[in-house]
């Protein structure tokens, strides 16, 4: 498990957000687990990070992820609603300078080291699709979500709104 230095335990509201989408509106350190309460863990293997979905032993400490929340304007010509809307996007960083990335070609979720500004592949649209669960939709590939496949995180195409509540794309955020 990785610690993230200099991050407050609780959410920190940032006041330097002069341009929507550039600075996070808030940051939150949380553990990530699946709908079925398996933990998302991160391990350094052969100088690269691997992401696992696993059951933790009773007193095993959960890995924490820094979630940075960004407010994104969604222009009316894209929304189809005739009005500009706002949505929340997140980046997820389990350790300093590394962020979850969507690899749309491989349908995989990977940890990449990168500097800010982060590429679009590191941003995910946040959905509350089920009671107290969230889903993460790829900014670069609408309709594709982070999901669980064979005890790993993968990118999963969701074909219709009825499938937005399927358990394998639902995650829980917890401080503990």
């Amino acid at each position: 498990a990785f610690g993230i230095s200099g991050v407050q335990k609780y959410t920190r509201a940032l006041h330097d957000s002069s341009i929507t989408g550039i600075s996070p509106i808030t940051e939150y350190l949380a553990s990530l687990s699946t709908y079925n309460d398996q933990s998302i863990t991160f391990a350094l293997e052969d100088e690269s990070y691997e992401i696992y979905v696993e059951d933790l032993k009773k007193d095993e400490k959960k890995d924490k992820v820094l979630l940075s929340y960004y407010e994104s304007q969604h222009p009316s010509n894209e929304s189809g609603d005739g009005v500009d809307g706002k949505m929340l996007m997140v980046t997820l960083s389990p350790t300093k300078d590394f962020w979850l990335h969507a690899n749309n070609k491989e349908h995989s979720v990977e940890l990449h080291k990168c500097e800010k500004p982060l590429p679009d592949q590191a941003f995910f649209v946040l959905h509350n699709m089920h009671s107290n669960c969230v889903s993460f939709e790829c900014k670069t590939d609408p309709g594709v979500f982070i999901g669980v496949k064979d005890n790993h995180l993968a990118l999963i195409k969701v074909d219709s709104s009825e499938n937005l509540c399927t358990e394998n794309i639902l995650f829980k955020l917890s401080e503990t």
Epitope: Y69, D81, V83, G85, K86, L88, M129
Partner: antibody, heavy 121, light 107 residues
Framework: QVQLQESGPGLVKPSETLSLTCTVS????????VHWIRQPPGKGLEWIGV???????GYNSALMSRVTISVDTSKNQFSLKLSSVTAADTAVYYC???????????????WGQGTLVTVSS | DIQMTQSPSSVSASVGDRVTITCLAS??????LAWYQQKPGKSPKLLIY???RLADGVPSRFSGSGSGTDFTLTISSLQPEDFATYYC?????????FGQGTKVEIK
Amino acid sequence: QVQLQESGPGLVKPSETLSLTCTVSGFSLSKYGVHWIRQPPGKGLEWIGVLRAGGSTGYNSALMSRVTISVDTSKNQFSLKLSSVTAADTAVYYCARDHYYYSSYGGFVYWGQGTLVTVSS
Amino acid sequence: DIQMTQSPSSVSASVGDRVTITCLASQTIGAWLAWYQQKPGKSPKLLIYAATRLADGVPSRFSGSGSGTDFTLTISSLQPEDFATYYCQQLDSSPYTFGQGTKVEIK
């Protein structure tokens, strides 16, 4: 522009079912969560429940056994049903829409004007 | 369920006064708190969301602060149109509970 409009009977008898409809325009129910909130005369706001963009629902635990929220996307409407009502359910009932696409984290930016429902025989 | 406790329940103030309303959550809710203003016979109006973000069209004399469990709404210089009831609401987890309200009255 975005609008929400509540409609339904203003008077319901005790033990019957309260039924309200919220008709929306200017946005898609497939993209935004919508909520029912009520306010008894002279009292505070009470959240009743949500219909999320993905179609799932969530309810106030104190009302859960009596409340149902459903949607008719073809009519741009969502509905509230509250069964076995008593005088304590007398309130102004509001429908409201989330601030953010797909997420309730940003609060409710658009509200209907509210409709008073009185429970009395 | 998360309980939201607002204080004070009412406050008497004059035009130009600085008014502070607090909201305490029974468990941590991150930054997911909204503040609403409601005038008699009217629907609530969103003032602040995500604890600190000013909603569109809301005057800059309104500001929000706090995170975790403790939150504050401040009106820096009270105007005649600000006399109303103010509610906080947590949006971290369903059910999305409201505080009991704070009535700002003319002194």
